[in-house]
Interface confidence: low
């Protein structure tokens, strides 16, 4: 049996196999040792008994999408049946005081691998034996503590495989310089030690994507916007746009990145090297926001230009972009791309990313201010309470509700929250009456809201003892 017989049905073409060489990976035409690593596929009845106490689930994740040339990292995490965990020695043990369907276990071990792995029977004195090998026969690497690593992970993609000895969680990084653009499939098979052989315990697959487009996300934030995720914002207040480039392997760390904005409101293009920008829309309506990101990234070098014909001199390729210690040059995709040739062959290529959104601009409450506070005289039965009127003004649209949050002087511990509907005239002037129990300093957060906006103002007030001579003070606003 060969690796491709064991590890999946996806058979890349000869072209794909030739042009997708992954550094450190091996061809799945290699032979698989079926004696040490028995082969089961889905539906085999032995899967049910391959792990004591239930099935092990393998979770495969990646930081896809990956810009071609960058590294993509795959992580596999094993999820054991309830009440089981891996201990510091790599053995699988029952968690203390944890009850599963079988009740509490008297035996602390699910699998006590230490017991047999320290038995050197059959070894040649170097810690190596005929069974401490991967499915292709390569010996296990002897890292410190390798005996405590009891799981064998076999990664398979693009007609190649990578073997790794590990614990209940492993990570593998792959450089994508030679990977064809588009979605690809990664499959992982996990084996556990079983005496002097191995038993499959889990199989998992996941699609990853290699792209020549810079993966771009934009977050948008605006003060007073009630719902930041609905792409509806307020007129006459700045919106902060923050560009997030998905580059987990820091491939673009040394690249100059340009951001080109079109806000869709006839304010023209805005080009910046900063990943954040503020923009204020001054009209209501629907606008198409467009962003283009450009980065000079490490990339393949173009072929040298042909020698010029005597009759027609050929223009030389630009050599203006900076040198870069690049990874192995790889395919750059099918689009016409700007290439720069550099004498030391560390070439760069301009990569692009795009973001588009349709945003809606509406009226909203732009600002709220407390312009006056008045201590209302209380009848005698409530000597400990103070009644205070807040006179509030606002700008923008007319609010439909008011909330006050009364808290301690640090504004952290809420003591009282009251919300109520309001009916406000065009002048947006209203009085909010609130009760304070006892003297002292209070933080007051006052918000005015409507369907799309929520405007806030805060103040610290000092409520005096119930001595009529003591004035009410606004500590700060």
């Amino acid at each position: 049996k060969r690796f491709h017989d064991v590890l999946g049905n996806e058979r890349p073409s000869a072209y794909m196999r030739e042009h997708n060489q992954l550094n450190g990976w091996s061809s799945d035409e290699n032979d698989w040792n079926e004696k040490l690593y028995p082969v089961w596929k889905r539906g085999d009845m032995r899967w049910k008994n391959s792990w004591k106490g239930g099935r092990v689930q393998a979770v495969l994740t990646s930081d896809s999408p990956a810009l071609v040339g960058s590294n993509i990292t795959f992580a596999v995490n094993l999820i054991f049946p309830r009440c089981q965990k891996e201990d510091a020695n790599g053995n699988i043990v029952y968690e203390k005081n944890c009850r599963n369907e079988a009740g509490l276990s008297a035996d602390p071990y699910v699998y006590n691998w230490t017991a047999w792995s320290e038995d050197s029977d059959g070894e040649n004195g170097t810690g190596q034996s005929h069974h401490n090998v991967f499915p292709d026969g390569k010996p296990f690497p002897h890292h410190p503590g390798w005996r405590r690593w009891n799981f064998i992970y076999v990664f398979h993609t693009l007609g190649q495989y990578f073997q790794k000895l590990g614990r209940c969680s492993v990570r593998v990084s792959v450089n994508t310089a030679n990977v064809t653009l588009g979605p690809q499939l990664m499959e992982v098979t996990v084996y556990r030690r079983h005496g002097r052989a191995y038993v499959p315990i889990a199989q998992v697959k996941d699609v990853y994507v290699v792209t020549d487009q810079i993966p771009v996300f934009v977050t948008m934030f605006q003060k007073n916007d009630r719902n930041s995720s609905d792409e509806t914002f307020l007129k006459d207040l700045p919106i902060m746009f923050d560009v997030l480039i998905h580059d987990p392997s820091h491939f673009l760390n040394y690249s100059t990145i340009n951001y080109k904005w079109s806000f869709g409101d006839n304010t023209g293009l805005f080009v910046s090297t900063n990943h954040t920008v503020n923009h204020t829309y001054v009209l209501n309506g629907t606008f198409s926001l467009n962003l283009t990101v450009k980065a000079a990234a490490p990339g393949p070098c173009p072929p040298p230009p042909p020698p010029p014909r005597p009759s027609k001199p050929t223009p030389s390729l630009a050599t203006t972009l900076k040198s870069y210690d690049s990874n192995t040059p790889g395919p750059a995709g099918d689009n016409p791309l700007e290439l720069s040739r550099i004498p030391d062959e560390n070439c760069q290529i301009n990569r692009y990313g795009h973001f588009q959104a349709t945003i809606t601009i509406v009226e909203g409450i732009l600002e709220v201010n407390i312009i006056q506070m008045t201590d209302v005289l209380m009848p005698v039965p409530w000597p400990e309470s103070s009644l205070i009127d807040f006179v509030v003004t606002c700008q923008g649209s007319i609010p439909t509700e008011v909330c006050t949050i009364i808290s301690d002087p640090t504004c952290e511990i809420t003591q009282n929250t009251v919300c109520s509907p309001v009916d406000v005239d065009e002048m947006c002037l209203l009085t909010v009456r609130r009760t304070f129990n006892g003297s002292g300093t209070y933080c007051v957060n006052l918000t005015l809201g409507d369907d799309t906006s929520l405007a806030l103002t805060s103040t610290l007030i000092s409520v005096p003892d119930r001595d009529p001579a003591s004035p009410l003070r606004m500590a700060n606003s």
């Epitope: 049905n9 028995p38 596929k41 889905r42």
Partner: antibody, heavy 122, light 107 residues
Framework: EVQLVESGGGLVQPGRSLKLSCAAS?????????MAWVRQAPTKGLEWVAS????????YYRDSVKGRFTISRDNAKNTQYLQMDSLRPEDTATYYC??????????????WGQGVMVTVSS | DIQMTQSPASLSASLGETVTIECLAS??????LAWYQQKPGKSPQLLIY???SLQDGVPSRFSGSESGTQYSLEINSLQSEDAATYFC?????????FGAGTKLELK
């Protein structure tokens, strides 16, 4: 040489029971993959009935026989069984004992017995 | 349940000819398909598993292939002993299901 020999078939009335046996030889019965029963009604196609894992701990049935048929095995005797209760006329068929392919997951059948006829009729 | 639609139900061919029998799965079975040959009064014999892997002892004139959920059994240079009924079976998931069969006769 792998051999599977069925026995226990015959004519039975609806609602009655019958127990089929399959004696295996030529391979290590307990260490190989599962065993199964597959049936074939007269002049009809093949229909998988039930499977059992090598240790006997896992059993699988087609919906139409669930609750009526029981598959089991005795590894010491190298024999698997099919206990058929509440038999119906539509259970009339030749019942084949079959071995699941021994190397892996695959629930196809690499060895078959000669078959035994079960007729359910009043 | 996964349905296996086998065609044709019967066919007649001459010695030395090549014949193709097809099986269509109602959903993806990931190459988990077997082909069996059954002669009158006999039990089925495994020919092909995993869509295209030849069982030990089966002549190389039998071959299997797939395209999506469509699976094919091809018999090259037909011999007299190939007259039989052929069944496909999906071994991807329970309940395991067979095609209705194709009866191959020699002219």
């Amino acid at each position: 040489e792998v051999q599977l020999v069925e026995s226990g078939g015959g004519l039975v009335q609806p609602g009655r029971s019958l127990k089929l046996s399959c004696a295996a030889s030529g391979f290590t019965f307990s260490s190989k993959s599962g065993m199964a029963w597959v049936r074939q009604a007269p002049t009809k196609g093949l229909e998988w009935v039930a499977s059992i894992s090598n240790g006997g701990g896992d059993t699988y049935y087609r919906d139409s026989v669930k609750g009526r048929f029981t598959i089991s095995r005795d590894n010491a005797k190298n024999t698997q069984y099919l206990q058929m209760d509440s038999l119906r006329p539509e259970d009339t068929a030749t019942y084949y004992c079959a071995r699941h392919r021994d190397y892996g997951y695959d629930a196809y059948f690499d060895y078959w017995g000669q078959g035994v006829m079960v007729t359910v009729s009043s | 349940d996964i349905q296996m639609t086998q065609s044709p139900a019967s066919l007649s061919a001459s010695l030395g000819e090549t014949v193709t029998i097809e099986c269509l799965a109602s959903e993806d079975i990931y190459s988990s398909l077997a082909w069996y040959q059954q002669k009158p009064g006999k039990s089925p014999q495994l020919l092909i598993y995993d869509a295209s892997s030849l069982q030990d002892g089966v002549p190389s004139r039998f071959s299997g292939s797939e395209s999506g959920t469509q699976y094919s059994l091809e018999i090259n240079s037909l011999q007299s002993e190939d007259a039989a009924t052929y069944f496909c079976q999906q071994h991807h998931d329970y309940p395991y299901t067979f095609g209705a069969g194709t009866k191959l006769e020699l002219k």
